[in-house]
Interface confidence: low
């Protein structure tokens, strides 16, 4: 068990043309907000596949009120790390996706609106109680800065967490067979209950007897490494089954190198071996430019002339990601208007509109009224991609063509009598009420009252009219 | 402009503890990684870990200071402090602060302090 | 942990001369070196991050070359105030680790 831990640095316009606007406005102030999904494995999942190694919501960052005229700055961030709590071994490779968030805090009906700003994702080998790793990636224009790292919570240790420390009974040495637990000198590894033979450095149990082998390693005791010529399905931490990375033990057990590097063991510790236009302790600088051709599905490449400015990738309809490199669920950003259905077609995106609404987003209100009359002198409205007639008085139905009965409805009050008429109708008032629907009633000195008395009060109660 | 400006020189006995500040300014204070060197007299430079004043929690420590020093942060202020324990004479040394080039990344160090004399004597 | 090597330990040269300084690394550090010049009383200043890029307000007299294991810094005429001792460093891994130093002397 132990916990992995992301700290945001920076979220803001990236370096290069392009710079996004704020995503906050005086009219329209709003703070972010951070979600982290971690899964094992180097795998290429969805962003909706679920977050198997666990997720984490920050806290919500400084209110941002943006200055007319004003650059997008770097936005106020929320305090605190995120932590990823894992109950079993950390695999030691682990693909995360961390998503920006913003909370609108204009008059919103219903409380505060959410909008995804940007999503970043990116596979890493990680050891457990290693040092903090530096990371920068790009979403579109925006640029995030962050580190992370892995730690397990005591009793466990280890680059998994797996092996299993605890107090020494003598103060001076541990019981037979036992060794003194690195880096925790005054403590005792625990006694094994694995399976005899299980590797102590790729495998691992949860139960007596058994031997669950960490990612990159195989057979019965994890002692065989996994064949590198076979890059097969994303797995978890105890399928390891096949797959295409060798961790060795030791300082690159869970490659430490971010961005593709390549580990290799020193006597003390270890080296990455970066991949062109990547630098840095563990890989985790990025100095490509466009003549590396980092942009995928074609997407095209801005500025980058040295690795000192970076370049942005322009993805086409459909892709997204620094490198252009995921597909986009373009449906998500709910781009059909007025209930319109999305169909995400690969190549393009449909729109399927209600009856009333065309358009490629569905955006076009049809003329509802447009060839279609109203009888008899009535009016028609437009509303909700159909129509209705207002109708003239003494006219009803869809179209207004039905004679209506003006007296259907019952308009006169208290027992007033109903005639229709030329021009509409007329109440007849019984005795001691007046007004056009029989609706006031008239004081014994001659002077008509409010409005009459609410339903379930007679004219006779005591009631006073505010 | 950038500036870090470090505490004035201290004086310790062996077994003590020496706690040495670094005051940034011109700058946003808690995005930016500051390394600890030291530098023995006549000697080389000597890397001892670093801290990101976003979060105190997170620093990295060179394995052969692990158990002795302590880098915490105060963002009112703008400081980040090194604390030193079970001092040696051999930990007499002008200690550095110095900033990392970019925000949370490089490792690289760009603007740096005057330097801190700990002078450890019995 | 990685050991830098520089030599030679002290170069006398004049002003206006060509100084050419060598930082060895113990294993390959691809390109994750830099270079530091110190003065007396003083803090180092970075002078190349990167083996080869140049720092704001550096002059275009100090450049860096190399990859892999060996490294060179070099500086193409010497002015009187780039007499000091200078330093490399490596980021490529834990601990970072500097050279001993070269001393650069008014011959």
């Known amino acids: 068990a132990g916990v992995f831990e992301l700290q945001i640095h920076s979220f803001g316009p990236g370096p290069g043309p392009g710079a996004p606007r704020s995503p906050c406005s005086a009219r329209l102030p709003c703070r972010l907000f951070f979600r982290v999904c971690l899964k094992p494995g180097l795998s290429e999942e969805a962003a909706e596949s679920p977050c198997a190694l666990g997720a984490a919501l920050s806290a919500r960052g400084p209110v941002y009120t943006e200055q007319p005229g004003a650059p997008a700055p770097d936005l106020p961030l929320p305090d605190g790390l995120l932590q990823v709590p894992f109950r079993d071994a950390w695999p030691g490779t682990f693909s995360f996706i961390i998503e920006t968030w913003r909370e609108e805090l204009g008059d919103q009906i219903g409380g505060p609106a959410w909008s995804l700003l940007a999503r970043v994702a990116g596979r890493r080998r990680l050891a457990a109680g290693g040092p903090w790793a530096r990371d920068i990636q790009r979403a579109g224009a925006w640029e995030l800065r962050f580190s992370y790292r892995a730690r397990c919570e005591p009793p466990a240790v280890g680059t998994a967490c797996t092996r299993l420390c605890r107090p020494r009974s003598a103060p001076s040495r541990c019981g037979p067979g036992l060794r003194p637990c690195a880096p925790l000198e005054d403590e005792c590894e625990a006694p094994l209950v694995c399976r005899a033979g299980c590797s102590p450095e790729h495998g691992f149990c949860e139960q007596p007897g058994e031997c669950r082998c960490l990612e990159g390693w195989t057979g019965p005791l994890c002692t065989v490494p996994v064949s590198t010529s076979s890059c097969l399905s994303p797995r978890g931490p105890s399928s390891a089954t096949t797959g295409c990375l060798v961790p060795g033990p030791g300082p690159c057990d869970g490659n430490p190198c971010a961005n593709g590097g390549s580990c290799s063991e020193t006597p003390r510790s270890f080296e990455c071996t970066c991949p062109r236009g990547f630098y840095g302790l563990r890989c985790e600088v990025s100095g490509v430019t466009c003549a590396d051709g980092p942009c995928f599905n074609g997407g095209l490449c801005v500025g980058g002339a040295d690795p000192d400015s970076a370049y942005i990738c322009h993805c086409p309809p459909g892709f997204q990601g620094s490198n252009c490199e995921k597909r986009v669920d373009r449906c998500s950003l709910q781009p059909c208007r007025n209930g319109g259905l999305c169909l995400d077609l690969g190549h393009a995106l449909r729109c399927r509109c209600r009856a009333g609404f065309a358009g490629p987003r569905c955006e076009h209100d049809l003329d509802d009224c447009a060839g279609r009359a109203c009888a008899n002198g009535g009016t028609c409205v437009e509303g909700g991609g159909a129509h209705r007639c207002s109708c003239a008085l003494g006219f009803g139905g869809r179209d207004c063509r039905e004679r209506a009965d003006p007296c259907a409805a019952r308009p006169c009050a208290h027992g007033g009598r109903c005639y229709a008429h030329f021009s509409g109708l007329v109440c007849a008032c019984a005795p001691g009420y007046m007004g056009a629907r029989c609706e006031f009633p008239v004081h014994p000195d001659g002077a008509s009252a409010l409005p009459a008395a609410p339903p379930g009060l007679r004219p006779g109660d005591p009631q006073r009219y505010l | 402009q950038v500036q870090l400006v470090q505490s004035g020189a201290e004086v310790k006995k062996p077994g003590a503890s020496v706690k040495v500040s670094c005051k940034a300014s011109?700058?946003?204070?808690?995005?930016?990684?500051i390394t600890w060197v030291r530098q023995a007299p006549g000697q080389g430079l000597e890397w001892m870990g670093d801290?990101?004043?976003?979060?105190?929690?997170?620093?990295n420590y060179n394995e052969k200071f692990k158990s002795r020093v302590t880098m915490t942060r105060d963002t009112s202020t703008s400081t980040v402090y090194m604390e030193l324990s079970s001092l040696r004479s051999e930990d007499t040394a002008v200690y550095y602060c110095a900033r990392e080039t970019t925000v949370g990344g490089a490792y690289a160090m760009d603007y740096w302090g005057q330097g801190t004399l700990v002078t450890v004597s019995s | 942990e990685i050991v830098l090597t520089q030599s030679p330990a002290t170069l006398s040269l004049s002003p206006g001369e060509r100084a050419t300084l060598s930082c060895r690394a113990s294993?390959?550090?691809?390109?994750?070196l830099h270079w530091y010049q110190q003065k007396p009383g003083q803090a180092p200043r970075l002078l190349i991050k990167y083996v080869s890029q140049s720092i704001s307000g550096i002059p275009a007299r100090f450049s860096g070359s190399g990859s892999g294991t060996d490294f060179t810094l070099t500086i193409s005429s010497l002015e009187p105030e780039d007499f000091a001792v200078y330093y490399c460093?490596?980021?490529?891994?834990?601990?970072?680790?500097f050279g001993g130093g070269t001393k650069l002397e008014i011959k």
């Open positions: 294993q390959s550090i691809n390109n994750n």
């Open positions: 011109g700058y946003t204070f808690i995005s930016y990684w």
């Open positions: 460093q490596q980021t490529q891994s834990w601990p970072l680790t």
């Open positions: 801290i990101y004043p976003g979060s105190g929690s997170t620093t």
